[in-house]
Interface confidence: medium
């Protein structure tokens, strides 16, 4: 009977040992499978994230295009209306002009003497820019960069006057220190009768026949 018990115990031990090995193998296999599944899940997750990012970007891009289209359509319809009305009323800026605070501005990329620049603006139903505030000055500087640029201010006919009749004496002024000085030490004949933005944005008077860049301005009519 003892020997039978011994045999049964040995058999149980063997079975238990086999079971342990088998269980370990299964745990290992499951662990490997788990890692594989985890990797696959991460892959799927990153693919989904990329797709979502792409979709978001596409959506943003589409929104921009739609906004631009709406703006273009509005601009075109406004241009058409202005064209039909012989340009007598303007409620939007011409193409390539920049709108700011109820005015349209055009920034030249070439250079001309003051008088020629003034004529150019007049042919565009505009005038050389009239600077009436610090905000407008800052806006213009952002768009111009540090370049000598004519403005619609001159004393060719006596006192300093803005080309659109804006009062000079009581209005905004942004001269460089000790300017205007009507300097004639340049030996070019006469003094300096036309105002321009200098490289730092402040104003200087200069010989009107110098070729500088220029800015045209035209007021927008209030839309009904």
């Amino acid at each position: 009977q003892n020997s039978q018990l011994r045999e049964d115990l040995l058999a149980l031990r063997q079975n238990f040992s086999n079971l342990t090995v088998s269980t370990e193998d299964q745990v290992k296999a499951l662990s490997t499978q788990g890692s594989s599944v985890g990797r696959k899940m991460k892959l799927v997750e990153s693919k989904l994230e990329k797709q979502q990012k792409d979709l978001t970007e596409d959506h943003s891009s589409l929104l921009l295009h739609v906004k631009q289209l709406v703006s273009d359509v509005r601009s075109l319809s406004c241009q058409m209306a202005a064209f039909r009305g012989n340009g007598s009323e303007r409620t939007c800026c011409p193409i390539n002009w920049v709108e700011y605070e109820g005015s349209c501005y055009w920034f030249s990329s070439s250079v001309r003497p003051w008088t020629e620049a003034d004529k150019y603006c007049q042919l565009e139903n505009a005038h050389l820019v009239v600077v009436t505030s610090r905000d407008e000055q800052n806006f213009l500087q952002r768009h111009m960069g540090p370049l000598n640029t004519w403005i619609g201010l001159t004393d060719q006919n006596g006192p300093w006057k803005w080309v659109d009749g804006t009062d000079y004496e009581t209005g905004f002024q942004n001269w460089r220190p000790e300017q205007p000085d009507n300097w004639y030490g340049h030996g070019l004949g006469g003094g300096e009768d036309c105002a321009h933005f200098t490289t730092d944005g402040r104003w200087n008077d200069d010989v009107c026949r110098r070729p500088y860049r220029w800015v045209c301005e035209t007021k927008l009519d209030k839309a009904n």
Epitope: R176, P177, E178, Q179, D181, N182, W183, Y184, G185, H186, G191
Partner: nanobody, 116 residues
């Protein structure tokens, strides 16, 4: 108070060189265009050369073009006139001026004599 003080004049032989200086004080020198003018004995004032505040542009009377060079050092508040190939007709009292619509501030001048 605005002050301009010229120096560097003297006696020089024809074909020689001189460098005039003008020390400025009492105003914002770097923003101010400056000029050199001269007055020969018994003659009126003659504009010689001009320079803008930043030194970027210079101007010369035809009579001195190619021989004289105007320059400035804004860090030293000083204006210069380098005069080469001097001629008898360049003899004069040279003044630097802070110029506006009229030459409102002058130095006392420095005498340049050209003689062999």
């Amino acid at each position: 108070e605005v002050q301009l003080l010229e120096s560097g004049g003297g006696l020089v032989q024809p074909g020689g060189s001189l460098r005039l200086s003008c020390a400025a004080s009492g105003f914002t020198f770097e923003t101010q265009p400056m000029i050199w003018v001269r007055q020969a004995p018994g003659k009126g004032l003659e504009w010689v050369s001009g320079i803008e505040g930043d030194g970027g542009r210079t101007y010369y009377a035809d009579s001195v073009k190619g021989r004289f060079t105007i320059s400035r050092d804004n860090s030293k508040n000083t204006l210069y006139l380098q005069m080469n190939s001097l001629r008898a007709e360049d003899a004069a009292v040279y003044y630097c001026a802070k110029s506006g619509s009229s030459f409102d501030y002058w130095g006392q001048g420095t005498l340049v004599t050209v003689s062999s």
